[in-house]
Each structure stands twice: as structure tokens, then as C-alpha cells.
């Protein structure tokens, strides 16, 4: 016997559906109606036939009471080919729900998203996460998607993007966005970062994550941030192959004084990079290739320094910097 496609835990909290059959019984998903966190994986299916069965232009207000009864706060949809019209229909209906977090992963969005009708209500998400989502509309996808969302989005994560750069002139500002995560876009690079950080469209960013994004030097990232007017409090550049030296011809970049936490772990560094901010609360240099303890003049003024997992550190070595947070044990790097 084939396993049930949907499983609801005994607390009505988590419901997971894996539709792997060529013609799945979508009604199985109804057992998820009382779950708080729902994951639906469509097994790579093309959802085009759905358009024939649903009226994408129907007034979603007719479903408002039904949708309001859903407990779902967090929804993950993955592994499908989705017509943009169907995605929009779903967003319009979900605007009446309690949904706060939406994750889309391994999706191919086909066709163009229609403009938001005047009477339509946007979806009041606090968090939107996209991983390996391709859009037929290329660079304008964020602007098209944005119009279907209310302006209160706080967290935006875009990984494995086919087009990580946006059509900046079409994108509206994200006034409430405090966390932007562009990690796992290895082809992004510092030029791509400049293109992705649309100037003055992310005025409230506090946390910027750029893990595994092809960044080359902290100074190059500094320049991209300065150009975009982005002033994060926390910056994660871990898991990039960073160069410690700066191109002598490159102009010196002044870091924003707002930056107080910098993660440079797993960056292949053999020495402390030049051009770091002068003062930081937290600096993570763990799991690099530092062969000697950094000298005080190489480091910023820092309250909390992590150097674990570097070759120069063996158990019992004196702490190389006042206020450092080394365990004395080399972690699995």
C-alpha cells in the first residue's frame, strides 16, 4: 500500500504533505486545515491543469470565512511548476488567512503575474523565504511579487536565485525589512550584490547575511553597502573565499558606524583582512587558516572575538586577545 501523502502530528501543529503520485489526490491536504505549520511538496508536478479547475479571477472574498478558520502561520510550498496566475490566486486567498511566514522552494513560476486589482488586499507576511525559485519574468519578479504583499515584510531570504539582481526601478521600498538573507547565491559576487541591493529600497536593514555568495574582500562588500545606503548592524560573510589583502588601487571604504557584528568564519583567511571596521562588538574569525595569533594592531577594537578552529590555536594556548571567546578546543571546522 502507498503511504498517506499527508501526515498531521498528534498536536495539530505540523502537517507535511508529499504528493509524489502523477495524479495526486489533492483533497488529502484537507487534513492540514487545523495545523499551524504546513509543508506541501508537490513532487515536481506541473500545476498548469489546476488553472482549468479553479477560477483564478474569482473574488477571493467569497472564501474569506473559510480561510480565516485556518490556523496556519507558516506555509512551505515546494517542488512544482506553478503558473503565475495560480500563485497570484493563492496569494489573494491567503490574504484573508493568519499566514505570517511563506517559504517557496524548488519552484518554477511560469507566465507573468497580473497587476494587483484596486480592491485586492495584500498578504500580511512578516517573512518570505525563496530557495531555488525561477521566474519567467526575469529581473522584474520581485517587483511583481511585492505588489501582492503588504509593506510590513520583516524578513526576506533569497537563496539559489536564478536572477538574484532585481529591476530596481520597479521595486518599491521595503520599509519594515530588518533582515535580508542572500546566502547560497555563489554567483552573486560583489557586482551582483550592488545590483541586488537596490539603493534606498532597504532602509531598515539590521541583519544582512551573505554566506556563500562569491564575495572576495570585506572592503568590496563595504563599497556595495555604501553605494546602496544599507547600514546593517550585523553582517555575515562566512563561507566565502575571502582575500585578506585589498587591491591597492581600490578606494578606501568607510564602514557604517552602525555595524557591530561581523562574521568572517569559514572564509579561508590566512591572515586578518585589511580594511575591517575600526570598532566592533562581535568579530567571528573561527574556522579559518590563521597560522599565528593576530596582533592587536591587526584587529579592530572588539568586545567579543572568536578564533576557535584556526591552526595556531591548540588546547592550552593563551588567549590571543582580551575579551575573546575561545573555548580552547578546536571545533569541527
Amino acid at each position: 500500500t502507498t503511504p498517506e501523502p499527508c501526515e498531521l502530528d498528534d498536536e495539530d501543529f505540523r502537517c507535511v504533505c508529499n504528493f509524489s503520485e502523477p495524479q495526486p489526490d489533492w483533497s488529502e491536504a484537507f487534513q492540514c486545515v487545523s495545523a499551524v505549520e504546513v509543508e506541501i511538496h508537490a513532487g515536481g508536478l506541473n500545476l498548469e491543469p489546476f488553472l482549468k479547475r479553479v477560477d483564478a479571477d474569482a473574488d477571493p472574498r467569497q472564501y474569506a470565512d473559510t480561510v480565516k478558520a485556518l490556523r496556519v502561520r507558516r506555509l512551505t510550498v515546494g517542488a512544482a511548476q506553478v503558473p503565475a496566475q495560480l500563485l497570484v490566486g493563492a496569494l489573494r486567498v491567503l490574504a484573508y488567512s493568519r499566514l505570517k511566514e511563506l517559504t517557496l522552494e524548488d519552484l518554477k513560476i511560469t507566465g507573468t503575474m497580473p497587476p494587483l486589482p484596486l480592491e485586492a488586499t495584500g498578504l500580511a507576511l512578516s517573512s518570505l523565504r525563496l530557495r531555488n525559485v525561477s521566474w519567467a519574468t526575469g529581473r522584474s519578479w520581485l517587483a511583481e511579487l511585492q505588489q501582492w504583499l503588504k509593506p510590513g515584510l520583516k524578513v526576506l531570504s533569497i537563496a539559489q536565485a536564478h536572477s538574484p539582481a532585481f529591476s530596481c526601478e520597479q521595486v518599491r521600498a521595503f520599509p519594515a525589512l530588518t533582515s535580508l538573507d542572500l546566502s547560497d547565491n555563489p554567483g552573486l559576487g560583489e557586482r551582483g550584490l550592488m545590483a541586488a541591493l537596490c539603493p534606498h529600497k532597504f532602509p531598515a536593514i539590521q541583519n544582512l547575511a551573505l554566506r556563500n555568495t562569491g564575495m572576495e574582500t570585506p572592503t568590496g562588500v563595504c563599497a556595495a553597502l555604501a553605494a546602496a545606503g544599507v547600514q546593517p548592524h550585523s553582517l555575515d560573510l562566512s563561507h566565502n573565499s575571502l582575500r585578506a589583502t585589498v587591491n591597492p588601487s581600490a578606494p578606501r571604504c568607510m564602514w557604517s558606524s552602525a555595524l557591530n557584528s561581523l562574521n568572517l568564519s569559514f572564509a579561508g583567511l590566512e591572515q586578518v583582512p585589511k580594511g575591517l571596521p575600526a570598532k566592533l562588538r562581535v568579530l567571528d574569525l573561527s574556522c579559518n587558516r590563521l597560522n599565528r595569533a593576530p596582533q592587536p594592531d591587526e584587529l579592530p577594537e572588539v568586545d567579543n572575538l572568536t578564533l576557535d578552529g584556526n591552526p595556531f590555536l591548540v588546547p592550552g594556548t593563551a588567549l590571543p586577545h582580551e575579551g575573546s571567546m575561545n573555548s580552547g578546543v578546536v571545533p569541527a571546522c
Epitope: 498536536e11 501543529f13 487545523s34 505549520e37 485556518l70
Partner: antibody, heavy 115, light 111 residues
């Protein structure tokens, strides 16, 4: 058998940050459910503070949201509460609890806010 | 926020009595076929203990003299035959919608 154990200082000064940790044994905080903090001022009723779910998603009581952070350390199977700018009104027994029907509770820890 | 109002706030009954506590919600706590209303017992100095979940389901290990009923906004906890060890404060709680809220409690004493 699932067990939850709260730990942290029993006395916090006004305006400081209250920090508590819940250590979970007999179950994984990253495999299922919601992991909550609930408090009870002396002689009063119960108040839900917020949760962190198996996925890392958080939900907070709006009455405390501006002061609360719930985080987790999956490697230690622990989740934590930070409540900033505390006053005497935050004096309470703090419980860590699993699920949204609260079937598993820690024994609770009394935190007194006083100078 | 959904407000839960319990009545009575306190009550005194004799051993063997049938005891009823009610909980009224300011709006429905139902999601489709389920009522997300739960009942707890708390003894002094102890953590609360789940008695009834989803309005009418008896939690494992709880004596069968405890039962729950109701839907949408009106719910009842019944103790069919009061025992001395049932002296405690009883709380209702909803998990249909965050913030998850509790009733103010009903203190039960033995006459």
C-alpha cells in the same frame, strides 16, 4: 519520557535583561512541536510569552513582543528566553512548555525583579 | 486577542459532588471540526497539568471522572464525583489563535 528543565538567575535587577534556558531531554526541539515560555506572577494566572517551533519560527505575545526574544541551540537541545528592560511586574514563575496544548511542563523557576 | 472568562471564580463542593466549571470565549476557538480549547489543573507550588485537550479529549493518565464538552465559544469541565485530591485551581486555555490565552482560573475547594 520528555522532560524540560528551566535554569537561570533567580534575581534580576530592574531595567536589566532576564535570561532563562530550557534544557530538553527525551525529545528533539528541531524535529517537531512548539517550545513555549509561559509565566505566572505570584498568586495570579498564567500568561503565554511566546514559542519557537521545530522549524525555528517564532511567535510572541504582542503585549511583550518588543522586549522578548526566544532562541534555540539545537546542538544542546536547548531553547532560551530573553526579556529586556524588566520591572517588578515581570516577577513570576517562568515555565518552559512543549506544544500548543501544553502537555509537558518544566517544574518552573521563580525570577524576582528587585534592586 | 481571544478573552476567556471562567465561572465561577471559586467554588466549594463536597466529596462525591458533581462539579461543573464553564469557560466562555470572546470569539470562536473552533477551526473546522476541532475546538482548540484545553483544561488544566494546578496545585499549589506545582506546574499546571493538562486534563482535557481539544474540548473533550481526556489526556492520558487523567482519571475518567474528568470530562469536557462544548464548541465555538462555550465550554464546560465536569468532575463527575469530586475527590479530595481534586482541590486545585482549574484553567481553560485556547490555542486556536495567537496570542494563546488562559482563563483567569477557578479555585476549587472541598466543603
Amino acid at each position: 519520557q520528555l522532560q524540560l528543565q528551566e535554569s537561570g538567575p533567580g534575581l534580576v535587577k530592574p531595567s536589566e535583561t532576564l535570561s532563562l534556558t530550557c534544557t530538553v531531554s527525551g525529545g528533539s526541539i528541531s524535529s517537531d512541536s512548539a517550545w513555549n515560555w509561559i509565566r505566572q506572577p505570584p498568586g495570579k494566572g498564567l500568561e503565554w510569552i511566546g514559542y519557537i517551533s521545530y522549524s525555528g519560527s517564532t511567535s510572541y505575545n504582542p503585549s511583550l513582543k518588543s522586549r522578548v526574544t526566544i532562541s534555540r541551540d539545537t546542538s544542546k537541545n536547548q531553547f532560551s528566553l530573553k526579556l529586556s528592560s524588566v520591572t517588578a511586574a515581570d516577577t513570576a514563575v517562568y515555565y518552559c512548555v512543549r506544544g500548543l496544548r501544553f502537555a509537558y511542563w518544566g517544574q518552573g523557576t521563580l525570577v524576582t525583579v528587585s534592586s | 486577542d481571544i478573552q476567556l472568562t471562567q465561572s465561577p471564580s471559586s467554588l466549594s463542593a463536597s466529596v462525591g459532588d458533581r462539579v461543573t466549571i464553564t469557560c466562555r470565549a470572546s470569539e470562536s476557538v473552533d477551526s473546522y471540526v476541532n475546538s482548540f480549547l484545553h483544561w488544566y489543573q494546578q496545585k499549589p507550588g506545582k506546574a499546571p497539568k493538562l486534563l482535557i485537550y481539544r474540548a473533550s479529549n481526556l489526556q492520558s493518565g487523567v482519571p475518567s471522572r474528568f470530562s469536557g464538552s462544548g464548541s465555538r465559544t462555550d465550554f464546560t469541565l465536569t468532575i463527575s464525583s469530586l475527590q479530595p485530591e481534586d482541590v486545585a485551581t482549574y484553567y481553560c486555555q485556547q490555542s486556536n489563535e495567537d496570542p494563546y490565552t488562559f482563563g483567569q482560573g477557578t479555585k476549587l475547594e472541598i466543603k
